[in-house]
């Protein structure tokens, strides 16, 4: 004959254990029902009556099957440098993570206790290792032939642009400035366009500056009718 299904509460077999989602109550010496997530034990079981469960109150939660007398309090509201990635419900705690541009300097079991702003690499330095959720940006000096002209937590050192004729050589914090070998229609004859107009982003009706120049910015330097002489400042 099949063994009878025991209904809680029941006395376990000697040396036996309670079933899944049950617990052994020391006072009653019985296997009793646990409460589901989102609830807690309002009344503990006795030899003749099972656990009585009740819903968690606002701002409290239980995440697991349990027999706790009171639900756990949700964590405090997220600070200004954090975003709430999981709201406080009856079944889960609030989780705060660092907002974009910040990283977790001190973590807790879930989410972050203390956020810190990602380091910004200053001009002449680029990002060697990007920031992650739990680690800061690592900066490095731009190597010869590369530059960064921004203060940024994301920009890497970029190569200097190739010039036919260099007007101003690049350095760690500035791109090379090129002279134009063939002025386009929108430029005055005998002008030097800084930087090189068409080695970069295309726009044929007017010269376009290199990416390191602010959009819509172009520089015209008047020079004599002959091409610029090669001097100490550049080619």
């Amino acid at each position: 004959l099949p063994a009878q299904v025991a209904f809680t509460p029941y006395a376990p077999e000697p040396g036996g254990t309670c079933r899944l989602r049950e617990y052994y109550d020391q006072t009653a010496q019985m296997c009793c029902s646990k409460c589901p997530p989102g609830q807690h034990a309002k009344v503990f079981c006795t030899k003749t009556s099972d656990t009585v469960c009740d819903s968690c109150e606002d701002s409290t939660y239980t995440q697991l099957w349990n027999w706790v007398p009171e639900c756990l309090s949700c964590g405090s509201r997220c600070s200004s440098d954090q975003v709430e990635t999981q709201a406080c419900t009856r079944e889960q705690n609030r989780i705060c993570t660092c907002r974009p541009g910040w990283y977790c300097a001190l973590s807790k079991q879930e989410g972050c206790r203390l956020c810190a702003q990602l380091r910004k690499c200053r001009p002449g330095f680029g990002v060697a290792r990007p920031g992650t959720e739990t680690s800061d940006v690592v900066c490095k000096p731009c190597a010869p032939g590369t530059f960064s002209n921004t203060t940024s937590s994301t920009d890497i050192c970029r190569p200097h642009q190739i010039c036919h004729v260099v007007a101003i050589p690049g350095n760690a914090s500035m791109d090379a400035v090129c002279t134009s070998t063939s002025p386009t229609r929108s430029m005055a004859p005998g002008a030097v366009h800084l930087p090189q107009p068409v080695s970069t982003r295309s726009q044929h009706t007017q010269p376009t500056p290199a990416p390191s120049t602010a959009p819509g910015t172009s520089f015209l330097l008047p020079v004599g009718p002959s091409p610029p002489a090669e001097g100490s400042t550049g080619d």
Epitope: H164, V166, T184, S199, S202
Partner: antibody
Framework: EVQLLESGGGLVQPGGSLRLSCAAS????????MHWVRQAPGKGLEWVSA????????YYADSVKGRFTISRDNSKNTLYLQMNSLRAEDTAVYYC?????????????WGQGTLVTVSS | QSVLTQPPSASGTPGQRVTISCTGS?????????VHWYQQLPGTAPKLLIY???QRPSGVPDRFSGSKSGTSASLAISGLRSEDEADYYC???????????FGGGTKLTVLG
């Protein structure tokens, strides 16, 4: 008429050196950036190095940085590529190319190429 | 692996129109940099076919045209001829690299 003529290729052992030359004519050599581009047998094109018109600034692909040196002699209208510490993967046809008018990032004229074979 | 992506091969019959694509990223084509195309006939040096996205050097037939949109570009060849059988390469400047970058090349076969 623009002409670019490479020379100096040949067979060299790994670790060895070679110097390529490119004789240019038909344009104002010193006004243009010049490039070296290579093509391994049966493979695609790979940019290797460039030099500005006045030879003040040089540019290299990461794969050759520290081993190759680009230079030019504007009085002789000649471009050079000194290749040291050569490796088997440097085996390729090496082309010299002229930077495009107004834009050094394209090549409006190419030489016929010179073959460099690195093998023991 | 090339920075710019091209189909390894393409084919068409004489008179047909074929297009070859070239896909890049936000650091090259998508950054607004011009795309250039080169033709390499068997056993010869590459030759400039299209520059600055859609400009043809003198001597290049108007059967060849180029276009660019977003992070990709394409080369179109109309009225295909047997002498168009060649390798075609796209190229562009890239923010993170010192020199221009190339596509892996597309081998165009003219059938029949």
């Amino acid at each position: 008429e623009v002409q670019l003529l490479e020379s100096g290729g040949g067979l060299v052992q790994p670790g060895g050196s070679l110097r390529l030359s490119c004789a240019a004519s038909g344009f104002t050599f010193s006004s243009y950036a010049m490039h070296w581009v290579r093509q391994a047998p049966g493979k695609g094109l790979e940019w290797v190095s460039a030099i500005s018109g006045g030879a003040t600034t040089t540019y290299y692909a990461d794969s050759v940085k520290g081993r190759f040196t680009i230079s030019r002699d504007n009085s002789k209208n000649t471009l050079y590529l000194q290749m040291n510490s050569l490796r088997a993967e440097d085996t390729a046809v090496y082309y010299c190319a002229k930077g495009g008018t107004g834009d050094p990032y394209y090549f409006d004229y190419w030489g016929q190429g010179t073959l460099v074979t690195v093998s023991s | 692996q090339s920075v710019l992506t091209q189909p390894p091969s393409a084919s068409g019959t004489p008179g047909q129109r074929v297009t070859i694509s070239c896909t890049g990223s936000s650091s090259n084509i998508g950054a607004g940099y011009d795309v250039h195309w080169y033709q390499q006939l068997p056993g010869t040096a590459p030759k400039l076919l299209i520059y600055r996205n859609n400009q043809r050097p003198s001597g290049v037939p108007d059967r060849f045209s180029g276009s660019k949109s977003g992070t990709s570009a394409s080369l179109a060849i109309s009225g295909l001829r047997s002498e168009d059988e060649a390798d075609y390469y796209c190229a562009a400047r890239d923010d993170g690299l010192s020199g221009p970058v190339f596509g892996g090349g597309t081998k165009l076969t003219v059938l029949g």
